[in-house]
C-alpha cells in the first residue's frame, strides 16, 4: 500500500468497532504527533481488501495498541 | 437498513459541468464520512474526493483537485459532487461511498479515499469531445 503522509489525520472518521480478526494482515499504530493530535489504529486487510480505521477506545484497538507497545518496549 | 443512491449523471461536452448528488439512509449520516469514487471502462476504481465527518476536511487526488468540490448537506443527508471542466478522461461510473472506517492515503502527491463500507450502485457519467 501507498506511504502515510503525517500531514493530516489519516483517519477521516470515528473508526470501526472491530474487524475480524483473520481478515487482519498488519496492524499499523500512528501516535499523536504535530500533525494530527489523536492516535489512530489503521488495519490493513488481507487479500488487498484495503484498509480501515480502528476506533482507537474500541476494545480491540486498545487490545492491539496494548500487544503493539508489549513489543516495542 | 443502508442506502446510498446517486443522481446527476449524464452527458456533458468537454468543459461542461454536472453536478452529481448522493442521498444517504438508514445510518447516522454525521458519524460517516463519505466519498466519490470512479471506474472507468477497463480501469480500477479510483477515489476521487472524501469529506471527513469529524471536521468536514476535504479531499482530492490530484487528477480532480482544482476542478472537482465535494459538499455536505447535513439536513438532508446529501453529499454533492459539483464538477467542472470536464475532460472526456473524466468519463466513467461515478460511485459514492461511506465508512466509519475510513482513510485518506497520500501517495505520488495526491490523496486516495479507502476503508469504505456501504456503497451505491453508481450514476455514469459521459463526457464527450
Known amino acids: 500500500f501507498p506511504m502515510f503522509k503525517r500531514g493530516r489525520c489519516l483517519c477521516i472518521g470515528p473508526g470501526v468497532k472491530a474487524v475480524k480478526v483473520a481478515d487482519i494482515e498488519k496492524a499499523s499504530i500512528m501516535y499523536p504527533s504535530n500533525n494530527c493530535d489523536k492516535i489512530e489504529v489503521i488495519i490493513t486487510l488481507k487479500e488487498n481488501k484495503g484498509q480501515r480505521c480502528l476506533n482507537p477506545k474500541s476494545k480491540q484497538a486498545r487490545l492491539i495498541i496494548k500487544k503493539v507497545e508489549r513489543k516495542n518496549f | 437498513e443502508v442506502q446510498l443512491v446517486e443522481s446527476g449523471g449524464g452527458l456533458v461536452q468537454a468543459g461542461g459541468s454536472l453536478r452529481l448528488s448522493c442521498a444517504a439512509s438508514g445510518f447516522t449520516f454525521d458519524d460517516y464520512p463519505i466519498g466519490w469514487f470512479r471506474q472507468a471502462p477497463g480501469k480500477e476504481r479510483e477515489g476521487i474526493s472524501c469529506?471527513?465527518?469529524?471536521?468536514?476536511?476535504?479531499y482530492y487526488a490530484d487528477s480532480v483537485k482544482g476542478r472537482f468540490t465535494i459538499s455536505s448537506d447535513n439536513a438532508k443527508n446529501t453529499v454533492y459532487l459539483q464538477m467542472n471542466s470536464l475532460k472526456p478522461e473524466d468519463t466513467a461510473v461515478y460511485y459514492c461511498?461511506?465508512?466509519?472506517?475510513?482513510?485518506?492515503?497520500?501517495?505520488?502527491?495526491?490523496?486516495?479515499?479507502?476503508?469504505?463500507?456501504?456503497w451505491g450502485k453508481g450514476t455514469l457519467v459521459t463526457v464527450s469531445s
Open positions: 461511498a461511506a465508512g466509519l472506517g475510513a482513510l485518506v492515503r497520500y501517495y505520488s502527491g495526491s490523496y486516495y479515499c479507502d476503508g469504505m463500507d456501504y
Open positions: 469529506i471527513s465527518s469529524s471536521d468536514g476536511s476535504t
